[in-house]
C-alpha cells in the first residue's frame, strides 16, 4: 500500500525524505510473527511488554507473564517450557558474533509465581533451550553442555573438554556460525526430548586472526579468533548423541561419518531429527560440490547410532557447488523415512523433490523456469512452500499449497491474489499441524501480517498493518520504484530503479549503483523499504539502481553457477553492462555515475571502479573483501576452490582489488572499514590502502574504531552522513 500520489494543489504540503528520517528510523515497519505453542495458540509480547497467550479458537487471551515480572530481572526475551510450567527470562544480552550472544537466565515458575531458587543457572550462558516436551533444559556454559531434568534440579555435565577458542560443544565456532549453520547453537533435541544431539568443534589447529580492540584503557586488548581463511586448517567436527534420561549410562555416542565423506576434509552441515530414534545428518566435502545426507537409527542393544550405507543419499553438482547458498535441508514425511528436499532438476532449476528410496528415483514435485525457495511445512495432506513462479518475477515470493494426499497433486497459490499490489513478497509461520498460519508480507507496499485458517486459507484477522507508518508517510514524497529486466547476450539482468518523486525522462539525473552481487544473493526484490537510497532519490534527486547479475540466485543454475571458480569477473561485468544500458535510456547524466557496496558489494564496487571503463566518477566500498585469500574458508572455497597451484591459486591472485591499484587513479574512491570487523577483517582495507599508497593514487578513507562488520550505533549515523557528503560532492550537489 503506497500512499497515493497527490495533485499539484496539495504538493506544497508534501516533503522530501531527510537523512535524519532515515537515521532515526522514522519510517521503519513492524512485522508480527506468532510464537506458536500449539495448533491454535500463540504467545506475543504486547505493547506494554506483557507476555500474552492467544487462543485462536476461543478468541480468548490472557497474560501468562506480567511486564512487572519481566522488568524485575530486566528481561529482554523469554521462553515458555512446552509443559507450560516454567518460563526462562533472558537478560544481560551481550552480543558476540552475527548470531551468538551470552545472557543471564532466570527461571520463573508459573505454578507458584516465583523464580526458581536453588541450583540457579551459571552466568553468562552461551545458549539455553527447553526440551520439545516437558521442561528439561539444555545449556552451554564455558563451551560445555549441561542438562537439567527440571529447572530446580542440579545440572548434569555432558561434556568436559570445552575450552575457549579451542573446543566448542553445543555451540559453533566462528566459521560454522557464520558460514555453515547460521545459528548460535549446535545442539538439537529429539522430538520428545529423549536424546540430545550436539556438535563438537575442535579449533586447536586453526590459525588465529588477531586484532586490536582499543576500548578506553591505556593498552588496547587483542581479540583472538580461530578463523580459517581460504586454504587454511579447518575445524574438526564430531557429532554426538546422549540419552537425556540416562546420560551416564554409556555417555555421549559419536555418530559415524559416511566413509566417502570421511576420506578427506569435510564439514557437517545440518542435523534433522526424524523421530526420537532416527536422525538425519548432512555432511559436505571440503570441496563443496558433494553433499551426503545420512539417516541413522538408534540400536537399543548396543546403545549406538547406526548409519547404513543404504540410507546415504548423495547430492552432487557438476556445474557448481552443492545447493544454493547452503545445501537445503530435508522435510520428512509422516512415514519417517521419505522426505521432501529442494535441489536442482535436470534443467538446472531448484525444485522440490520427493525422495523415497534413492535420489536417482526422486519424484519431482515442482517444475518450471523458476525456483522453489523454501518448504515451510509438510502435513498428512499438504505441502506448503514458497517460490518466485508467479508472473515470472524472480524477486517475488508467494506461498503455495500442494495437496499431497490426492493424485495427481493439485497446486494452489495461497497469496498471489490476496493484496496483489501491496503484497508480492511473503513469508509464513505455521502452527502445529498447520492448523493456522501467519502470513508476513514485506512489500512492495507497506508490510502487513495476517492470520489464516490452515484448512481454508481464510484470513482470520490482521495481526499488524502498520497504520502509524501509513499515516506518517502520507505527506512524504517517496521515490518511485520500478522492477524491470534487461536482456543482454542471452542473460537476463533484473534491476530495480529508484526514481526521484518528480522524475522526468527528458531530464538528466546522477546515477548511483548499489551493489551486493555475492553468490546466491538477490538484491532486486519486491519489498518495502524507506532507507538511505530512498532519501538520495527523494531529497537529492538521484536515480539509484540495483542489478542482479550473474552469480545471483533464484533464476536457475546457469546464472547462479556462472561465477563458479571466478569470483570478481562476471558480477562486475554485469554491473557495467547495466550502467551502459541505463545510459542508453536517456535520463542518466553519464558524467555523474557512482557505485557503492558493502561487504561483497564493497569488493564489486571496488573492482567496478578499477575496471578502467571510465563509466564511474566515484564510488564507495564499505568493509570490502580485497583478496579471497583473506576471507573465510567455508564461504570462499565453496565458490573458488582452494588457493593452491594445482587448484585455483591463479584466479585468487588475479581477482584482488590490490592488483588493480593503478586503475583507481581516475576515480574518486572512498574506502571505509571497522577496525574490529571479525568477519571481513580490517586487513582487507589495510591492504587496499597500502597498494594505493604504493601506487601513489589519492583516495579517501574512513575507519570506525572498535566497530564490526555492521558499523552499528553512532557509527551508522556518521557513516551515512559521511557517504552522503562524498556523493553530493562527487555529483556537484549543493549541501
Amino acid at each position: 500500500l503506497r500512499p497515493s500520489r497527490v495533485h499539484n494543489s496539495e504538493e506544497n504540503t508534501m516533503r522530501a525524505l531527510t537523512l535524519k528520517d532515515i537515521l532515526n528510523g522514522t519510517f521503519s515497519y513492524k512485522t508480527f510473527f506468532p510464537n506458536w505453542i500449539s495448533g491454535q495458540e500463540y504467545l506475543h509480547q504486547s505493547a506494554d511488554n506483557n507476555i500474552v497467550l492467544y487462543n485462536i479458537e476461543t478468541g480468548q487471551s490472557y497474560t501468562i507473564l506480567s511486564n512487572r515480572t519481566m522488568k524485575s530481572v530486566n528481561a529482554s526475551n523469554y521462553g515458555l517450557s512446552p509443559d507450560r510450567q516454567f518460563v526462562y527470562l533472558e537478560s544481560d544480552y551481550s552480543k558476540l558474533w552475527r548470531y551468538s550472544y551470552t545472557a543471564t537466565y532466570y527461571i520463573y515458575d508459573l505454578s507458584n509465581g516465583e523464580f526458581v531458587r536453588g541450583n540457579e543457572l551459571p552466568r553468562p550462558i552461551q545458549y539455553l533451550c527447553w526440551s520439545p516436551v516437558g521442561s528439561k533444559l539444555a545449556y552451554v556454559y564455558q563451551n560445555n553442555i549441561y542438562l537439567k531434568q527440571r529447572p530446580g534440579d542440579p545440572p548434569f555435565q555432558i561434556t568436559f573438554n570445552g575450552r575457549e577458542n579451542k573446543i566448542f560443544n553445543g555451540i559453533p565456532d566462528w566459521v560454522y556460525e557464520e558460514e555453515m549453520l547460521a545459528t548460535k547453537y549446535a545442539l538439537w533435541w529429539s522430538p520428545n526430548g529423549k536424546f540430545l544431539a550436539y556438535a563438537e568443534f575442535n579449533d586447536t589447529d586453526i590459525p588465529v586472526i588477531a586484532y586490536s580492540y582499543y576500548g578506553d584503557e591505556q593498552y588496547p586488548r587483542t581479540i583472538n579468533i580461530p578463523y580459517p581463511k581460504a586454504g587454511a586448517k579447518n575445524p574438526v567436527v564430531r557429532i554426538f548423541i546422549i540419552d537425556t534420561t540416562y546420560p551416564a549410562y554409556v555417555g555421549p555416542q559419536e555418530v559415524p561419518v559416511p566413509a566417502m565423506i570421511a576420506s578427506s576434509d569435510y564439514y557437517f552441515s545440518w542435523l534433522t531429527w526424524v523421530t526420537d530414534e532416527r536422525v538425519c545428518l548432512q555432511w559436505l566435502k571440503r570441496v563443496q560440490n558433494v553433499s551426503v545426507l545420512s539417516i541413522c537409527d538408534f540400536r537399543e542393544d548396543w546403545q549406538t547410532w547406526d548409519c547404513p550405507k543404504t540410507q546415504e543419499h548423495i547430492e552432487e553438482s557438476r556445474t557448481g557447488w552443492a545447493g544454493g547458498f547452503f545445501v537445503s535441508t530435508p522435510v520428512f514425511s509422516y512415514d519417517a523415512i521419505s522426505y521432501y528436499k529442494i535441489f536442482s532438476d535436470k534443467d538446472g532449476y531448484k525444485h522440490i523433490h520427493y525422495i523415497k528410496d534413492t535420489v536417482e528415483n526422486a519424484i519431482q514435485i515442482t517444475s518450471g523456469k523458476w525456483e522453489a525457495i523454501n518448504i515451510f511445512r509438510v502435513t498428512q495432506d499438504s505441502l506448503f512452500y514458497s517460490s518466485n513462479e508467479f508472473e515470472e518475477y524472480p524477486g517475488r515470493r508467494n506461498i503455495y499449497r500442494i495437496s499431497i494426499g490426492s493424485y495427481p497433486p493439485s497446486k494452489k497459490c495461497v497469496t498471489c491474489h490476496l493484496r496483489k499490489e501491496r503484497c508480492q513478497y511473503y513469508t509464513a509461520s505455521f502452527s502445529d499441524y498447520a492448523k493456522y498460519y501467519a502470513l508476513v508480507c514485506y512489500g512492495p507496499g507497506i508490510p502487513i501480517s495476517t492470520l489464516h485458517d490452515g484448512r481454508t486459507d481464510q484470513e482470520i484477522k490482521i495481526l499488524e498493518e502498520n497504520k502509524e507508518l501509513e499515516n506518517a508517510l502520507k505527506n512524504i514524497q517517496l521515490p518511485k520504484e520500478e522492477i524491470k529486466k534487461l536482456e543482454v547476450d542471452e542473460i537476463t539482468l533484473w534491476y530495480k530503479m529508484i526514481l526521484p518523486p518528480q522524475f522526468d525522462r527528458s531530464k538528466k539525473y546522477p546515477l548511483l549503483i548499489q551493489v551486493y552481487g555475492g553468490p546466491c544473493s538477490q538484491s532486486v526484490r519486491s519489498v518495502f523499504a524507506v532507507n538511505w537510497i530512498s532519501y538520495l532519490a527523494s531529497k537529492e534527486g538521484m536515480v539509484i539502481a540495483l542489478v542482479d547479475g550473474r552469480g545471483t540466485a533464484f533464476q536457475g543454475d546457469k546464472l547462479l553457477y556462472a561465477v563458479y571458480r571466478k569470483l570478481g569477473v562476471y558480477e562486475v561485468e554485469d554491473q557495467i553492462t547495466a550502467v551502459r544500458k541505463f545510459i542508453e535510456m536517456g535520463f542518466i547524466d553519464e558524467k555523474r555515475i557512482a557505485i557503492w557496496g558493502w561487504s561483497y558489494g564493497g569488493y564489486v564496487s571496488s573492482l567496478a571502479l578499477a575496471s578502467g571503463t571510465g563509466l564511474f566518477k566515484c564510488g564507495i566500498a564499505v568493509a570490502p573483501v580485497s583478496s579471497w585469500e583473506y576471507y573465510a574458508s567455508v564461504y570462499t572455497e565453496r565458490f573458488m576452490g582452494l588457493p593452491t597451484k594445482d587448484d585455483n591459486l591463479e584466479h585468487y591472485k588475479n581477482s584482488t582489488v590490490m592488483a588493480r591499484a593503478e586503475y583507481f587513479r581516475n576515480v574518486d574512491y572512498l574506502l571505509i572499514h571497522g577496525t574490529a570487523d571479525d568477519n571481513v577483517h580490517f586487513q582487507n582495507s589495510a591492504q587496499i590502502a597500502k597498494a594505493l599508497v604504493n601506487a601513489q593514487v589519492d583516495f579517501q578513507a574512513m575507519w570506525y574504531s572498535d566497530q564490526n562488520h555492521g558499523l552499528s550505533g553512532l557509527s551508522t549515523n556518521h557513516l551515512y552522513t559521511h557517504m552522503t557528503h562524498f556523493l553530493k560532492q562527487c555529483f556537484s550537489l549543493s549541501d
Partner: antibody, heavy 118, light 107 residues
Framework: EVQLVESGGGLVQPGGSLRLSCAAS????????MSWVRQAPGKGLEWVSW????????GYADSVKGRFTISRDNSKNTLYLQMNSLRAEDTAVYYC???????????WGQGTLVTVSS | DIQMTQSPSSLSASVGDRVTITCRAS??????LNWYQQKPGKAPKLLIY???SLQSGVPSRFSGSGSGTDFTLTISSLQPEDFATYYC?????????FGQGTKVEIK
C-alpha cells in the same frame, strides 16, 4: 518440598513375599528415575533396583535379580518393590530414593525395615 | 561391577580439623562420583555430586575433587554436626555401587 515416604516393611519368613511402597510428593514424579537402596543392620549401603520414568526400563543388583520386581504408578506418584523368595540376608532398612540422571541419589525417604526371619 | 574402596574406614578428629577421605574406583568412572553423609538412624544425605559439585544447602566447608579413579572428600574445618559416616558412590552404567563407608568420630 520433595518428600518420599516408604511403607510396607515388616517381619516375613524366609521364602515369603512383601511389597514395599513409596509415596512421592513435591516434584514431578513421572519425570524421574526412581530407585531402592538398602542397608543391612550395621552395614553399608547397597543399591537394589531402579526404574525409568515411564516404567519400561529397569535395573537390578545381581543379589536380587529374578526375585525382586520394581514398578511404579505415575498416576498415583507411587513406587513399588515386590520382594519374593525372601532370604535372611535381605534383612535391611529399605530406602526409596530419586536417582537423578541415573547417577546420584539426591532425595531419600526415611526408610522402612524389612526383617526376614523364621 | 565397579568396586569402590574408601579409606580410611574410620578416623578420629577434633572440631576445627581438616579431614580428608579418599575413594578409589576399580576402573575409570570419569567424574561420576558422589558423596553422602549418614547419621545413625537417619537416611543418607547427598553432599557432593559429580565429584566436585556441592549439593544445594550443603555447607561450603565440604568439597570434592578428583576424576577417573581417585577421588577425595574434604571437610575444611570439622564441625560438631559433621560426626557421621560418609559414603562414596559411583554412578556409571546404571549400576551404582557404594564404598564401604568412613566413620568420622570425635577424638
Amino acid at each position: 518440598e520433595v518428600q518420599l515416604v516408604e511403607s510396607g516393611g515388616g517381619l516375613v519368613q524366609p521364602g515369603g513375599s512383601l511389597r514395599l511402597s513409596c509415596a512421592a510428593s513435591g516434584f514431578t514424579f513421572r519425570g524421574y528415575i526412581m530407585s531402592w537402596v538398602r542397608q543391612a543392620p550395621g552395614k553399608g549401603l547397597e543399591w537394589v533396583s531402579w526404574i525409568g520414568p515411564e516404567g519400561s526400563r529397569t535395573g537390578y543388583a545381581d543379589s536380587v535379580k529374578g526375585r525382586f520386581t520394581i514398578s511404579r504408578d505415575n498416576s498415583k506418584n507411587t513406587l513399588y518393590l515386590q520382594m519374593n523368595s525372601l532370604r535372611a540376608e535381605d534383612t535391611a532398612v529399605y530406602y526409596c530414593a530419586r536417582l537423578l540422571y541415573g547417577t546420584w541419589f539426591d532425595y531419600w525417604g526415611q526408610g522402612t525395615l524389612v526383617t526376614v526371619s523364621s | 561391577d565397579i568396586q569402590m574402596t574408601q579409606s580410611p574406614s574410620s578416623l578420629s578428629a577434633s572440631v576445627g580439623d581438616r579431614v580428608t577421605i579418599t575413594c578409589r574406583a576399580s576402573q575409570s568412572i570419569s567424574s561420576y562420583l558422589n558423596w553422602y553423609q549418614q547419621k545413625p538412624g537417619k537416611a543418607p544425605k547427598l553432599l557432593i555430586y559429580a565429584a566436585s559439585s556441592l549439593q544445594s544447602g550443603v555447607p561450603s566447608r565440604f568439597s570434592g575433587s578428583g576424576s577417573g579413579t581417585d577421588f577425595t572428600l574434604t571437610i575444611s574445618s570439622l564441625q560438631p554436626e559433621d560426626f557421621a559416616t560418609y559414603y562414596c558412590q559411583q554412578g556409571t552404567l546404571l549400576l551404582p555401587t557404594f564404598g564401604q563407608g568412613t566413620k568420622v568420630e570425635i577424638k
